[in-house]
């Protein structure tokens, strides 16, 4: 004999307390699949979390973070404080990146500047706390007779197909 609970639709639960009636989920709860014997409690987006999607009888609420914070973890399980570019978050709050490191985002850690010399290149633009260095051409490319500027291609007259 088929279990009647298996056919209770999403948004309901098979209420054993009430002789296996497919009863609507109580407020602030949901069942996203059929055949459930209980409804799951809706996630509440409190404090630093804010509601991105309200809970319904068939789907859980979804949270994101209030301004000044960003989501971490699956389904935004945590909110982490934003820092400015050029900073990283430590246990003591936002701290400027140390010399030789940078962070171009409001989250994450400071990372070391690129070491241009490892690629045999020179530093074209110095790094800052917010930006990585920009590596230039290798010194060999700058030897006498070598042009560092590519000449522009000749312009075609309009209306003519290339030969």
């Amino acid at each position: 004999l088929q279990d009647p609970c298996s056919n209770c639709p999403a948004g309901t639960f098979c209420d054993n307390n009430r002789n296996q009636i497919c009863s609507p989920c109580p407020p602030n709860s949901f069942s996203s699949a059929g055949g459930q014997r209980t409804c799951d409690i809706c996630r509440q987006c409190k404090g630093v979390f804010r509601t991105r999607k309200e809970c319904s009888s068939t789907s859980n609420a979804e949270c994101d973070c209030t301004p000044g914070f960003h989501c971490l973890g699956a389904g935004c399980s945590m909110c982490e404080q934003d820092c400015k570019q050029g900073q990283e978050l430590t246990k003591k709050g936002c701290k400027d990146c140390c010399f030789g490191t940078f962070n171009d985002q409001k989250r994450g850690i400071c990372r070391p500047w690129t070491n241009c010399s490892l690629d045999g290149k020179s530093v074209l633009v110095n790094g800052t706390k917010e930006r990585d260095v920009v590596c230039g051409p290798s010194p060999a490319d700058l030897s006498p007779g070598a042009s560092s500027v590519t000449p522009p291609a000749p312009a075609r007259e309009p209306g003519h197909s290339p030969q």
Epitope: P4, N7, T12, Q20, I21, S23, P24, S29
Partner: antibody, heavy 118, light 112 residues
Framework: QVQLVQSGAEVKKPGASVKVSCKAS????????MHWVRQAPGQRLEWMGW????????KYSQEFQDRITISRDTSASTVYMELSSLRSEDMAVYYC???????????WGQGTMVTVSS | DIVMTQSPLSLPVTPGEPASISCRSS???????????LNWYLQKPGQSPQLLIY???IRASGVPDRFSGSESGTDFTLKISRVEAEDVGVYYC?????????FGQGTKLEIK
């Protein structure tokens, strides 16, 4: 809009059967259980039974167990309540009611008056 | 069966005044999900009943906030903060927890 429309008044003789229909509209019929409640003149409301509209399983009050049958036609979004071996005490208004919130009957039919008279 | 007992059976009220109806169940109506399965209905003259409160204290959709439900063990109360002429009718409590679901005998609210 969401509504339940019941069949019209009935006059029956003692010992006969009556079948009252309740047509649902404006919502997904198979999602919500349907209950039957009756009210004899000047009396309190009396619960008779329910049907899981989507599944078809039913539960009845012991008082009516041997005489009541609740059935449904999902294609017509209609639930039926049949009461047999009618007696004078069965003269009442019969209501269908949707359990649209947990434990709460949020939508009621307009009622069907059943008169039992010889 | 769970017996539901209401009081008073008749309640004359002056418009604008508060009103209170009591309902006592012979057994606990507490579900394993933490809610009390107790409803309040109003049946206006010549009409079908309408749901006011479910799960003890939750107002049904469209019910004015002058209606409120409270619970204490097996004692339940429906309060109307300021009675209006349209509130006349018979108020029923009902338990939908244990078959057979049972109703109170009703409280008739009338305007003085």
């Amino acid at each position: 809009q969401v509504q339940l429309v019941q069949s019209g008044a009935e006059v029956k003789k003692p010992g006969a059967s009556v079948k009252v229909s309740c047509k649902a509209s404006g919502y997904t019929f198979t999602t919500y259980p349907m209950h039957w409640v009756r009210q004899a003149p000047g009396q309190r409301l009396e619960w008779m039974g329910w049907s899981n509209a989507g599944i078809g399983n039913t539960k009845y009050s012991q008082e009516f167990q041997d005489r009541i049958t609740i059935s449904r036609d999902t294609s017509a979004s209609t639930v039926y309540m049949e009461l047999s071996s009618l007696r004078s005490e069965d003269m009442a208004v019969y209501y269908c009611a949707r359990e649209g919130v947990a434990g709460g009957f949020d939508i009621w039919g307009q009622g069907t008056m059943v008169t039992v008279s010889s | 069966d769970i017996v539901m007992t209401q009081s008073p059976l008749s309640l004359p009220v002056t418009p604008g005044e508060p009103a209170s109806i009591s309902c006592r169940s012979s057994q606990s109506l507490l579900h394993s999900n933490g809610y009390n399965y107790l409803n309040w209905y109003l049946q206006k003259p010549g009409q079908s009943p309408q749901l006011l409160i479910y799960l003890g204290s939750i107002r049904a959709s469209g019910v004015p906030d002058r209606f409120s439900g409270s619970e204490s063990g097996t004692d339940f109360t429906l309060k109307i903060s300021r009675v209006e002429a349209e509130d006349v009718g018979v108020y029923y409590c009902m338990q939908p927890l244990q078959i057979p679901y049972t109703f109170g005998q009703g409280t008739k609210l009338e305007i003085k």
